[in-house]
């Protein structure tokens, strides 16, 4: 376990920092200059630093389950769970699902009444008794209802010519009803005669384009539970069609731009506002069906099976069955689909804030296990054979008290999960003894909480009317800086620097801005290691015999000595046994200066006074020319020829000596003086 903590000054802040963090409430656990944050660390670290086990605060996430034995048949247990969540630490609990035999079923038959479904309608009219009989084989309480759909009644979905709106069928002799979006024909009932009678009254209709408005109809079936008559039981929606479906965006073709609002808009059992709202998106419909526990069974003809299989990948708890061209196999299809649906169990939860994460481990009866999935999933679930899901809930921060619901999709049972924060430390501060805080505060988890007007580790500092901002101002370099560089406590306007966990690191300075390790390194060690130098506030101070910014050099000048054993020829300094030459002089020994201006003009007056005791420096020659020494013998060096103060040409040679502006000068005996005009 790790404990990565940022500015932590209380037990609660510590617990919020992560699941590996624990808090030591021991009195005087911190030494002078220690920040309160050192109380917050991993359990092994605190134990190692002398905090007794019973002084360590480490609240853990936990789950409490409550069974509710009242009420009817329950397929999910427990019914209620209370979780206490510490940030970053999961609380786990088990949910058991036991599939009940003979669970009540509501089946709503939603049928496409476009013209191509003519023969299907004939068969469905005779179906009522068969359907109920089939349901009664599965359950003691089955009910059936009926609805139908065509499409939106605007171009290009239907032909809007008045004659075609009256009778959309291609065969004029055929009695046909005007097109409509969705009609709720029969509320859910256990009366098969009523089904036969109401469905028997239905007439085929027609539309223009191939896809139908089936999603519009499904949305209304899901959004209008009272009108449809859904009970709180297994809800099946049989969707029978021989063609595809329009979805969100298609409405634009008919200038319908308002998105589907997912609400019930039935008036006189008709979806009369279908031309105002676009078709729903598949995701929107999937959400609405799941929210209302409705399991769709797509009964579609062979050419449409692939299309609707794709749809079932998006809509959870849905199935596809191949419908014969005349719907004669629909009862068999529904039985198969129901068995398939009821033997697959999905455990899911309602939408949660980002601060809560839920995962499921599914332990299915056939030995299959799925771990850390976003929802529970078991297939091949047998009647009365329990299966277990382990639910893990994690909070990313200290959450508000809240609840959410876990349900098995398609079933009405729910598990209510109440979530509470586990962020408080129940510290056993022996008493409200104020003496430990200089009588100016009380103890909370080992830390003094000071009265107003007092601050400091033991409330020892009186603010004396100065605001905490003023006091803190003395502990900042400037307004943009952090108090004590973030490395100390501001106590009475002075920084008390923290002790560091890093070996060899000492923090100091007015604003705790200095330390003993943040210096240049050499050979991977600060200041070349303790044998070469030490680090003081970002700068290496080298031991005798070493130099350089990281004490990387031995203090020797051998490489800087010219043939006369003068360091850098007196025109530079020796650093790390290499010359650093003054401006213009060249390495290695600062002997030459190719770019320097000629010294000839500078020294003509010195040549004149040294040799001939004439010129402006005549009376003060040695003081005016301190760096020059007259030679009686010719020298090697720069040859000069300059006019003296009397206009005569003087020839002389300058040989540079070690040091700056130091020359040996040899001046020719004779001057060339040109006679002026008479």
């Amino acid at each position: 376990q790790e404990c990565t903590k940022f500015k932590v000054s209380s037990c609660r802040e510590c617990i919020e920092s992560g699941p590996g963090c624990t808090w030591c409430q021991k009195l005087n656990f911190t030494g002078p200059g220690d920040p309160d944050s050192i109380r917050c660390d991993t359990r092994p670290q605190l134990l190692m630093r002398g905090c007794a086990a019973d002084d360590i605060m480490d609240p853990t996430s936990l789950a409490e389950t409550q069974e509710d034995h009242n009420g009817g048949q329950k397929q999910l247990s427990p019914q209620k769970v209370t979780l206490y969540l510490r940030p970053g630490q999961a609380a786990a609990f088990n949910v058991t699902f036991r599939r009940a035999k003979g669970y009540p079923i509501d089946l709503y038959y939603l049928m496409d009444l476009s013209y191509s479904m003519l023969d299907d309608l004939r068969n469905v009219k005779k179906l009522g008794g068969d359907l109920l009989r089939a349901l009664n084989e599965i359950t003691e309480s089955g009910r059936i209802g009926f609805g139908s759909f065509v499409d939106k009644t605007v171009l290009p979905f239907v032909n809007t010519h008045p004659d075609k709106l009256r009778n959309p069928c291609p065969n004029k002799e055929k009695e046909c009803q005007p097109p409509f979006a969705f009609r709720h024909v029969l509320k859910l009932t256990n009366n098969s005669n009523q089904f036969q009678t109401e469905v028997g009254k239905q007439l085929i209709s027609g539309n223009l384009d191939a896809p139908e408005g089936g999603l519009d109809a499904m949305m209304q079936v899901a959004a209008c539970p009272e009108e449809i008559g859904w009970r709180n039981v297994t809800r099946l929606l049989v969707f029978a069609t021989d063609d595809g479906f329009h979805f969100a965006g298609d409405g634009k073709l008919g200038a319908i731009l308002t998105p589907n609002d997912g609400r019930c808009h039935l008036e006189d059992n008709l979806y009369k506002r279908s031309n105002e709202f676009d078709y729903p998106s598949v995701g929107q419909l999937a959400h609405k069906l799941a929210e209302n526990n409705i399991q769709p069974i797509f009964a579609v003809t062979s050419r449409m099976v692939k299309t609707y299989e794709k749809l079932t990948e998006i809509i959870p708890k849905s199935a596809v069955g191949e419908l014969s061209e005349d719907s004669s196999n629909v009862v068999h299809l529904i039985k198969n689909a129901y068995n398939k649906l009821s033997s697959r169990v999905f455990l899911d939860h309602n939408a949660l804030p980002d601060t809560l994460k839920v995962t499921y481990d599914s332990f299915c009866s056939n030995g299959v296990t799925h771990r850390n999935q976003p929802r529970g999933d078991c297939d091949g679930v047998q009647i009365n054979v329990p299966i277990t899901f382990q639910v893990k809930v994690t909070a990313t921060e200290c959450i508000q008290e809240q609840s959410f619901v876990i349900r098995a999709l398609g079933f009405t049972d729910i598990v209510t999960v109440q979530v509470l924060p586990q962020c408080e430390c129940r510290c056993r501060d022996q008493s409200r003894d104020r003496s430990l805080c200089h009588g100016k505060g009380f103890l909370e988890c080992g830390i003094c909480r000071c009265d107003t007007g007092y601050i400091g580790k033991n409330c020892e500092c009186q603010t004396q009317g100065r605001s905490s901002q003023e006091l803190e101002g003395s502990c900042r370099k400037d307004n943009n800086s952090i108090i004590c560089s973030g490395l100390g406590d501001c106590v009475c306007g002075q920084c008390l620097c923290h002790t560091s966990d890093v070996p060899g690191k000492l923090i100091y300075g007015q604003y705790c801005e200095c330390d003993t390790i943040n210096c240049e390194r050499y050979n991977g060690q600060v200041c070349g290691g303790p044998g070469r130098g030490l680090c003081f506030c970002g700068k290496c101070r080298c031991h005798p015999g070493f130099e350089g910014s990281a004490c990387q050099c031995e203090r020797t000048t051998e490489g800087c000595l010219n043939p006369r054993r003068v360091e850098c020829s007196g025109r530079g300094r020796c650093r790390c046994n290499v010359c650093e030459c003054h401006s213009g002089y060249q390495l290695p020994l600062c002997q030459e200066c190719p770019g320097c201006p000629s010294p000839c003009g500078k020294y003509i007056s010195c040549a004149e006074c040294l040799k001939f005791e004439k010129g402006p420096f005549g009376k003060n020659c040695s003081a005016a020319c301190p760096g020059l020494q007259l030679s009686n013998n010719p020298v090697k060096g720069r040859t000069c020829k300059e006019r003296d103060s009397e206009g005569c040409w003087v020839a002389y040679t300058l040989e540079q000596q070690d040091g700056m502006d130091r020359y040996l000068i040899y001046v020719d005996e004779s001057r060339e003086c040109v006679a002026g005009p008479n």
């Epitope: 000492l506 100091y508 300075g509 604003y511 200095c514 003993t516 506030c537």
Partner: nanobody, 112 residues
Framework: EVQLVESGGGLVQPGGSLRLSCAAS????????VDWYRQAPGKGREWVAI????GTTNSRDSRFTISRDNAKNIVYLQMNSLEPEDTAVYYC?????????WGQGTQVTVSS
């Protein structure tokens, strides 16, 4: 305002010793690094010794020892076996609150 005052300089014979002092207002010297530098005639300033608030010390030459008296708020530089090359003005310097402060210096002359 931070003020540093050096004292203890003077004329000493080669091989002799001197103890220089650096005093400051407040308790600053006990809370930051204190350096001694020196500047010989015609040369640049060169570092001599340092002491940190927690007592760690270092010097460029083993003849020089730096120490502190926190009660008096003074830092000392003990110089032994002095040589003529040690002739210079000796300065104490601190880095405090993002600024560098220098004293006015004390002259040390080593001559026979």
């Amino acid at each position: 305002e931070v003020q540093l005052v050096e004292s203890g300089g003077g004329l000493v014979q080669p091989g002799g010793s001197l103890r220089l002092s650096c005093a400051a207002s407040g308790s600053i010297l006990s809370r930051t690094d204190v350096d001694w530098y020196r500047q010989a005639p015609g040369k640049g300033r060169e570092w001599v010794a340092i002491i940190a608030p927690f007592g760690t010390t270092n010097s460029r030459d083993s003849r020089f020892t730096i120490s502190r008296d926190n009660a008096k708020n003074i830092v000392y530089l003990q110089m032994n076996s002095l040589e003529p090359e040690d002739t210079a003005v000796y300065y104490c310097r601190i880095y405090w609150g993002g600024n560098v402060y220098w004293g006015q210096g004390t002259q040390v002359t080593v001559s026979s």
